[in-house]
Interface confidence: low
């Protein structure tokens, strides 16, 4: 808190300019009019104020706008945004994507701070859904943004927004998130031809069910092992050796290196050893010849 003192003669700020960097904190408090500051916020960013001086400027704006800053001020906060607390930001009503971009730019290159998380939350809630332009902006600044959302939050993402998602945006998503995103991606890309469709859908396949994987195996897609290893185990288990061979194409040889890891390990245990031997990869652990395989899940469904 800065003490209230009279402004020294001749020091009253007529405009926000670089001469203010030499004002002591109490002089800034006494000599800079809050309304002038609010109308010339765009200049603050071009002036090398210290963090202590920025504290004083923030204090002045807080006094002028106790209910929260108007968007005209927020858009030009620049580095003063780093001084805001999540509590400050919860008072704001940010509706313009340009404002959001301007503030994200300030935090660029840093981890998502609580301030930024609060800002994004306020913005998205204000819009009602994660539209394509917003998602485009957020993933450009924070590639991991999508995977930081809960499955419930992801359910508000319209399929049209999926076009903005890049493979790296999904790197940290878990299966529950991909379960939500995959059907949206399938819908978004449904009118593309086979090879183009696979390129787009590939990153989302961690949420694909068995029947979709079977369908893909008929389309010569040559899925790489990295993608295969991210598939849902329960979706892979019912695939036959022939289907996996078709799905992976020339990459099928990579199964040997992954035979101890899920989902490959669990899939091997479900296959007849005879069938595995047809791959010529030396995969071991399949069901020995002559053993009868009972599908208990089918039996339960019938009884």
């Amino acid at each position: 808190e800065v003490e209230k003192t009279a402004c020294p003669s001749g020091k009253k700020a007529r405009e926000i300019d670089e001469s203010l960097i030499f004002y002591k904190k109490w002089e800034l408090e006494a000599c800079v009019d809050a309304a002038l500051l609010a109308t010339q916020m765009d200049r603050v960013n071009a002036i090398p104020f210290t963090y202590e001086q920025l504290d004083v400027l923030k204090h002045k704006l807080d006094e002028l706008y106790p209910q929260g800053y108007p968007e005209s001020v927020i858009q030009h906060l620049g580095y003063l945004f780093l001084k805001m607390s999540p509590e400050d930001i919860r008072k704001w009503n940010v509706t313009s994507l340009e404002t959001l971009k301007a503030l994200l730019e300030v935090n660029k290159g840093h981890e998502m701070s609580p301030q930024v998380a609060t800002l994004i939350d306020r913005f998205v809630k204000g819009r009602g859904q994660l539209d394509k332009d917003t998602l485009d902006t957020l993933t450009a600044f924070y590639p991991g943004y999508l995977c930081s959302l809960s499955p419930e939050e992801l359910s508000s993402v319209p399929p049209s927004s999926i076009w903005a998602v890049r493979p790296q945006d999904l790197d940290t998503c878990d299966p529950r998130q991909l379960d939500v995103l995959y059907p949206k991606a399938r819908l978004a890309f449904q009118n593309m031809n086979g090879s183009e469709y696979f390129v787009k859908i590939q990153s989302f396949l961690g949420g694909a069910p068995t029947e979709d994987l079977k369908a893909l195996s008929q389309q010569n897609v040559s899925m790489d092992l990295a993608t295969f290893m991210k598939l849902r185990t329960d979706a892979v288990l019912p695939l036959t050796v022939a289907e996996v061979q078709k799905l992976l194409g020339p990459h099928v040889e990579g199964l040997k290196a992954e035979e101890r890891h899920r989902p490959v390990r669990d899939w091997i245990l479900r296959q007849r050893q005879d069938d595995l031997d047809t791959l010529g990869l030396g995969l071991q652990g399949g069901i020995p010849n002559g053993y009868l395989v009972l599908d208990l899940s089918m039996q339960e469904a019938l009884s």
Epitope: D17, E18, S19, L20, I21, F22, N45, A46, I47, P48, F49, T50, Y51, E52, L54, G78, Y79
Partner: nanobody
Amino acid sequence: EVQLVESGGGLVQPGGSLRLSCAASGDTLSTYAMGWFRQAPGKGRELVAGITSSGSGTYYPDSVEGRFTISRDNAKRMVYLQMNSLRAEDTAVYYCAARRIGPVYDPYSVYNYWGQGTQVTVSS
């Protein structure tokens, strides 16, 4: 980035004058606010004069107000510190420093670029 080299220091009697110069190379000087600091033995650095990038605003602490004058010539890429009525307590190494116009990331080092310093000794 800007490189700074100070000159003009030396031995002067109390009451005497000295003019320090700071030559800048690298970036355009007009994009930097400039300051003169001093550091006496066993003490921290203190800002004794500051000037805005255009030269329109200056700052002096009470200890040198009226005795020291900072000026700049952006075309010649020079900054000057005219020191009059020198006292024994003005003895120190004097540094020229620059701070970029734009946001300050680090609250502890407002000035980004420093010269090597020039010794000023006031003694009879």
